[in-house]
Amino acid sequence: IVLRPSRVHNSEENTMRALTLKDILNGTFSYKTFFPNWISGQEYLHQSADNNIVLYNIETGQSYTILSNRTMKSVNASNYGLSPDRQFVYLESDYSKLWRYSYTATYYIYDLSNGEFVRGNELPRPIQYLCWSPVGSKLAYVYQNNIYLKQRPGDPPFQITFNGRENKIFNGIPDWVYEEEMLATKYALWWSPNGKFLAYAEFNDTDIPVIAYSYYGDEQYPRTINIPYPKAGAKNPVVRIFIIDTTYPAYVGPQEVPVPAMIASSDYYFSWLTWVTDERVCLQWLKRVQNVSVLSICDFREDWQTWDCPKTQEHIEESRTGWAGGFFVSTPVFSYDAISYYKIFSDKDGYKHIHYIKDTVENAIQITSGKWEAINIFRVTQDSLFYSSNEFEEYPGRRNIYRISIGSYPPSKKCVTCHLRKERCQYYTASFSDYAKYYALVCYGPGIPISTLHDGRTDQEIKILEENKELENALKNIQLPKEEIKKLEVDEITLWYKMILPPQFDRSKKYPLLIQVYGGPCSQSVRSVFAVNWISYLASKEGMVIALVDGRGTAFQGDKLLYAVYRKLGVYEVEDQITAVRKFIEMGFIDEKRIAIWGWSYGGYVSSLALASGTGLFKCGIAVAPVSSWEYYASVYTERFMGLPTKDDNLEHYKNSTVMARAEYFRNVDYLLIHGTADDNVHFQNSAQIAKALVNAQVDFQAMWYSDQNHGLSGLSTNHLYTHMTHFLKQCFSLSD
């Protein structure tokens, strides 16, 4: 059990107060993390509280300002990037968000040697992406869907691509679906390790159907937003990968990297690019039916100035029980011989583990094993491999950092974090300097987050980077809910759950229950992390019990649980939430007449289906920006788990798994449906169709739309949303205002 105490430091309990909704909406109890911006093995940059950019040297213990807040303010910079040769800094301003990762900005180059901005050949605006080369101070940037190169910031640019066109051809940046569902980045270009070559993707969206929605704004007529967006079964983007020599870019121009024959024979995706050396690159490809992935290692042929990808350097990863990989296919981490690599994929027992591939995948050497999963490989050095897993004490919702000594035989394993701050810290990530000389650990909970700096050889803690002292003090007089993480064993399935209990919880009393669900494939909600959020308030102030349950389809507990939902979305995720609720009722402290469920996005889909399950368990529920039919969602995501919506594939389940098909079943529940009209991700269409089906079935329901808001419902909409949902739940549970 992980309990978060109420922290009663004062004998007079009346000095303690419950959380308020205002606390949550104001972000009163938000925490800070510290991720060093590493610039060498022993130096990092950090933006100070007063906005100076400060260089810290761990070994000398010295720090000094390299860029003043005055310079930052002179161009209203909100971000910066130091060139690897330390000559220049780019300053980023006029940030304008596009989709989840993408944004445009204005960039200024500041010369640190002279203490002034570079004049002449200034960068155009707005720029879609800009980055330094890994060595020196070359610049690559994307402007109006074309890629440009500068040898030095003051030089005129060299235009690499010319065919870029809004919503048609994207060079060096992903289109909507690649950004959201495949790359999870705003960029699609990659420098080779020493900056000799630049690789980039070209996405051709010419034939993709367009989603169009109104953006109301303030004008007399609304604008129409058009996004090439392939829904399940629709025409997909066509991707090509090119590499250009940045030293002599005009010599032969961009050279296309060949696609493996077994991939090119039908629709396919490019999934990632990893440079190995300046003249060796690794590309990963995926069939449209996403159970076959090919990793292809390609070499530069000096004589022909082309890239050669021999079949002997093709490694196939295939899943027979589900899709390839977890959420994404994992990426390789190459070792110093520049041909062998480490990679996470399923072992014979169906658990994701680290494997070492020297020649073929069939001959892979398994590095980790057990009924737990390796989650991320952080760094491979000559003698150590650092990774995270959920092995420790068999809690799948924890993350600890491990070091495997690969320089010695047999390799020895050490948990770096397991016993550091055991009660406070059970969920870590890490950030490594060059050669893993030093690293930062960022602990997310279950206690108050803390960031620390460590020696990469001894693992010794050097200093605390951020310990959230102010937050700790602010929470001293707050009655926080108690949290426990436990598991239910039901029909050979383990259902881990997190229960958030009111501060004065008494097992002999009855409490209203709210289920918070996400439940999407390869997600995890039950995590040992710190949070003071809306559900904390509902437990603290309103006396609700809140539960989160990880059912079938969720991650990091083996392929049996993960792939259980393959081709059957909307069935087992819902069943497992219902099963858990029945178990919670059996515990004796739940008022079974006051049970609600809510979720956002995939969670909105699951909560809607749970409400319409006909069990009579739920009195009410909320769906925020739900998917309502898998035919409405993005091809890359949907087809990964559902196959194609065609008669000879999986159309029947596409049709059976809609929320609309269950409209009649909403008659006996109170349903609140919420969506942003400018949702580029889960289109408003989804909720429009639910509403239409409910109206056609003459079923009463409540709804709220947020004009011109996207999938995140940010800004003032957030406050309105949570206030509205609070009123709805309090009314449902007969709680006084």
């Epitope: 000398t60 390299i66 310079t71 130091l82 040697s113 203490g115």
Partner: nanobody
Framework: QVQLQESGGGLVQAGGSLRLSCAVS????????MGWYRQAPGKQREWVAG???????DYARFVKGRFTISRDNAKNTVYLQMNSLKPEDTAVYYC??????????WGQGTQVTVSS
């Protein structure tokens, strides 16, 4: 405040060599990352070479393969060995932190003149 004293400049013929030194005082700790910079007449100051506290070096493209930066932590001194000098290397050479600190703290530099 750190004091920087550059020396070793002079007049040399094209193809010749020079070794510049930079004595760092006022700093008790080990040397931070240090760099050499230069300013030619009528031009802006530019970075030439850098060495970090782990002795990892980096060079501007126009001097790569000809110049070598090194350091002696015991003497708190940074060096720049300049070989195969060209007339375009003529400039006042400065040493400083790499990158320089704010506000900048430049020494008086040392003049290098390369005749053809």
């Amino acid at each position: 405040q750190v004091q920087l004293q550059e020396s070793g400049g002079g007049l040399v013929q094209a193809g010749g060599s020079l070794r510049l030194s930079c004595a760092v005082s006022g700093s008790t700790a080990r040397l931070d990352a240090m760099g050499w910079y230069r300013q030619a007449p009528g031009k802006q100051r530019e970075w030439v070479a850098g060495i970090d506290s782990a002795d990892i070096t980096d060079y501007a493209r126009f001097v790569k393969g000809r110049f070598t930066i090194s350091r002696d932590n015991a003497k708190n001194t940074v060096y720049l060995q300049m070989n195969s000098l060209k007339p375009e290397d003529t400039a006042v050479y400065y040493c400083n932190k790499w990158p320089p600190s704010v506000p900048p703290n430049w020494g008086q530099g040392t003049q290098v003149t390369v005749s053809s």
